[in-house]
Interface confidence: medium
């Protein structure tokens, strides 16, 4: 499919001008290559009319120009003094005319309306309001006032001052007679339809002395604004329909076959399933304007979108509307990243988030999409060191690996963490990506105690058991804080006995805290990584208390509270992969400290988007 995009149809009137914008992916090659506008012949081929290399056909001499805007990835063709001969099929493109890097444009130039003398022209957008003013003389002040529409050869009464209203205009028309000082009546038509366009005649009086005024009403279907966005990127539709519909339900719909327009989202709470997790309808301002953000753009999102206002929350005849034609460029600068990440209850996920590498100093954010009402995405963590209170100790945003990617780690997973999350920065708003976290059946791979109590002035040793599948990974311990997780020295204690059917490649790596102080209290993570790419993590909370009896502590798995959704058996046994195993160190006298922390706020359900781009979390 060609990545060039422009308007499919351009309509104008003889004598007028048009401006046609064509979009292309702004690669360095494309920015500098030839741009052209050509007319398609009946037998194929495409005859150049104007190009960026200075060529202008004699047909366009003195009335056309082509301007390239390489920084935007657009070029614009302006054509003036249009005639009906200019109607036809054209292409705007890059390179050689026959190469296929082009977009088909249909230009239709119609004859201007043949208007009677003294005709007032009203040009109004579809769905809006028109006021037709009709002057009259004093002698007709008390006589009947009326408005007719010319249908074929005959005038048809639309409204009059005796109370008649044509059924086609019921509920959306009124006739106002100004105060005695002004010799004027006006007809106001709301929610204009395309069928309202035409010639009108207003009249005061019915005899030969009546006053008449001709009006030509042109109802404009909104020209769609062209929007060119990258696959996997994001688009924002800004919809400003005016204060007169500030209190009317708003909608965004996508045109399907014919005149159907399927609701994508509306302010009445409707949202199309295909946009679950990746759409927000932002609140209206007092003037009735609103915006819709869609992330994770897919090929199938391309098409014509309309925003509008109607009490039903969907497109109806007479709805005021705005239109966009969205083109999704498959030659995307936004790299592929997993759209689904899987983790197990009690385990962890590490999510890779792409950003525009030109903006390495931008603030990075991670937020949780919530579908309630019109959708919102409250922030959970940012790269400035803010972490939402309920996520302290289990969420971290790391600038690594850098160069266009940052990492978010979330551990101590529960079923409530299932949902959609957005990666974004305060820089390029097009780089908003969505990832769905799914919680699947399974056990966490890393085994750590639950909460641990250390004694002031003593030594604490905390174990982390790594199964053999992580034999080639770097293993680490770190202390969590709101800006990241600071690495700590750890000791490899040899093979772990915590895994069934696991050979000598399993590992027990311990964190040792010597001469414990109050400052040692907090969250500690053990984890695996390969270079700057992070894998699974497990978290332990270390509490610090006053000395009761001398000695050092060697904490074992039995001191753990159960990870969420996991059972701890009596007599110091922990059930791992449905097989109870016994560790010789499980019988230390220390009791576990209860963990009552808030794992996450709110309850969320997972929605399976059926994506094939999946990344494993704690288990496959």
């Amino acid at each position: 499919k060609s990545p060039i995009f422009g308007p499919e149809e351009v309509n104008s009137v003889e004598g007028n001008s048009v401006s046609i914008t064509c979009y292309y992916p702004p690669t360095s090659v494309n920015r500098h290559t030839r741009k052209y506008w050509c007319r398609q012949g009946a037998r194929g081929g495409c005859i150049t009319l104007i190009s960026s290399e200075g060529y202008v056909s004699s047909k366009y001499a003195g009335r056309a120009n082509l301007t390239n805007f390489p920084e935007n990835g657009t070029f614009v063709v302006n054509i003036a003094q249009l005639s009906q001969d200019d109607s036809g099929r054209y292409k705007c493109g890059l390179g050689i005319n026959s190469r296929g890097l082009s977009f088909d444009v249909s230009l239709e130039v119609s004859q201007g309306p043949g208007l009677l003398n003294d005709t007032k022209v009203y040009t109004v957008d579809l769905g809006r309001t028109v006021t037709i003013n009709c002057p009259f003389k004093t002698e007709n002040a008390q006589k009947r006032k009326s408005l007719y529409k010319q249908i074929g050869l005959y005038p048809v009464l639309v409204i009059d001052s005796s109370g008649y209203v044509n059924p086609n205009y019921t509920g959306r028309i009124r006739l106002d007679i100004q105060g005695t000082g002004q010799l004027l009546f006006s007809v106001v038509i709301n929610q204009l339809r395309l069928s309202d366009a035409g010639q009108y005649l207003c009249q005061a009086g019915d005899d030969s002395n009546s006053n008449k005024k001709n009006a030509d009403l042109q109802v404009l279907k909104p020209e769609p604004e062209l929007v060119y966005e990258d696959l996997r990127g994001s688009v924002t539709f800004h919809c400003a329909l005016g204060p007169e519909v500030a209190n009317v339900a708003k909608f965004l719909c996508r045109q399907s076959s014919g005149e159907n327009c399927d609701v994508v989202v509306n302010t009445l709470g409707k949202r199309a399933p295909a946009f679950e997790g990746r759409i927000l309808l932002n609140p209206q301002d007092k003037d009735g304007s609103f915006s819709v953000v869609i992330t994770g753009l897919r090929k199938e999102d391309a098409g014509r979108y309309l925003c509008g206002a109607h009490s039903d929350g969907q497109l109806q005849e007479g709805s005021p509307i705005q239109a966009w034609q969205l083109f999704v460029n498959e030659e995307s600068t936004i790299p592929r990243s997993p759209t689904v990440v899987k983790g197990v209850a009690g385990g962890s996920v590490a999510v890779l988030c792409p950003y525009n590498r030109k903006e390495s100093k931008s603030i990075k954010y991670w937020c949780l999409w919530e579908g309630a009402q019109n959708g919102r995405c409250p922030l959970l963590v940012d790269s400035e060191g803010w972490v939402k209170a309920q996520y302290e100790g289990r969420l971290s945003l790391l600038e690594e690996p850098g160069n266009g990617t940052f990492t978010v780690i979330l551990n101590q997973l529960t079923s409530r963490d299932a949902g959609f999350y957005w990666c974004l920065t305060n820089g390029d708003t097009l780089w908003r990506t969505t990832v769905e976290i799914k919680i699947i059946e399974g056990e966490p791979n890393l085994k750590v105690p639950g909460n641990v109590t250390a004694v002031l002035g003593e030594t604490l040793k905390v174990p982390c058991h790594f199964p053999c599948k992580f034999s080639s990974y770097e293993k680490y311990w770190c202390k969590w804080n709101n800006t990241g997780c600071q690495a700590l020295p750890s000791q490899d204690e040899g093979p772990s006995k915590a895994f069934v059917n696991c050979d000598e490649n399993s590992r027990l790596v311990s964190l040792t805290l010597n001469l414990v102080t109050r400052a040692d209290e907090g969250w500690y993570w053990c984890g695996v990584k390969q270079g700057h790419f992070y894998g699974e993590t497990a978290a332990v909370y270390v509490a610090v208390e006053e000395r009761k009896a001398a000695g050092s502590r060697d904490v074992s798995l039995a001191k753990a509270d159960a990870a969420p959704d996991e059972k701890v058996l009596d007599s110091g046994f922990r059930e791992i992969e449905n097989k109870a195993i016994q560790d010789p160190r499980l019988f230390a006298e220390e009791k576990a400290v209860a963990d009552t922390r808030d794992q996450a706020d709110g309850s969320r359900a997972s929605v399976d988007s059926g994506s094939s781009e999946e990344q494993g979390g704690s288990s496959r």
Partner: nanobody
Amino acid sequence: EVQLVESGGGLVQAGGSLRLSCAASGRTFRSYAMGWFRQAPGKEREFVADISWRGGRLYYADSVKGRFTISRDNAKNTVYLQMNSLKPEDTAVYYCAATGDQPAFTTAQGMGAMLEYDYWGQGTLVTVSS
């Protein structure tokens, strides 16, 4: 749990200035975004300004832009609202509020509806006479 206490309200001439303070108790103050709201007699409560946890991101209602300034001092657990060029229509009870969410982010990033504030003060009355 965060408790909020506003002070600094009072009677002032049109064109004058006032500085409202909101003292918060609770060790997690620094991780909360703070906002000021106001409610004029017989009207709904309306948003005035909010500030992110570190004070780097600010957001103002159009009606107060350029006249009011929100700031915070995390060491003192206090958020301020400096009100200059006061007008009679600024007369209202001013409330301080705190949220564990980050509304300055939400609004600036187009991330959805104004967020729910978890904690509210009792309010302080500001009267601007003409």
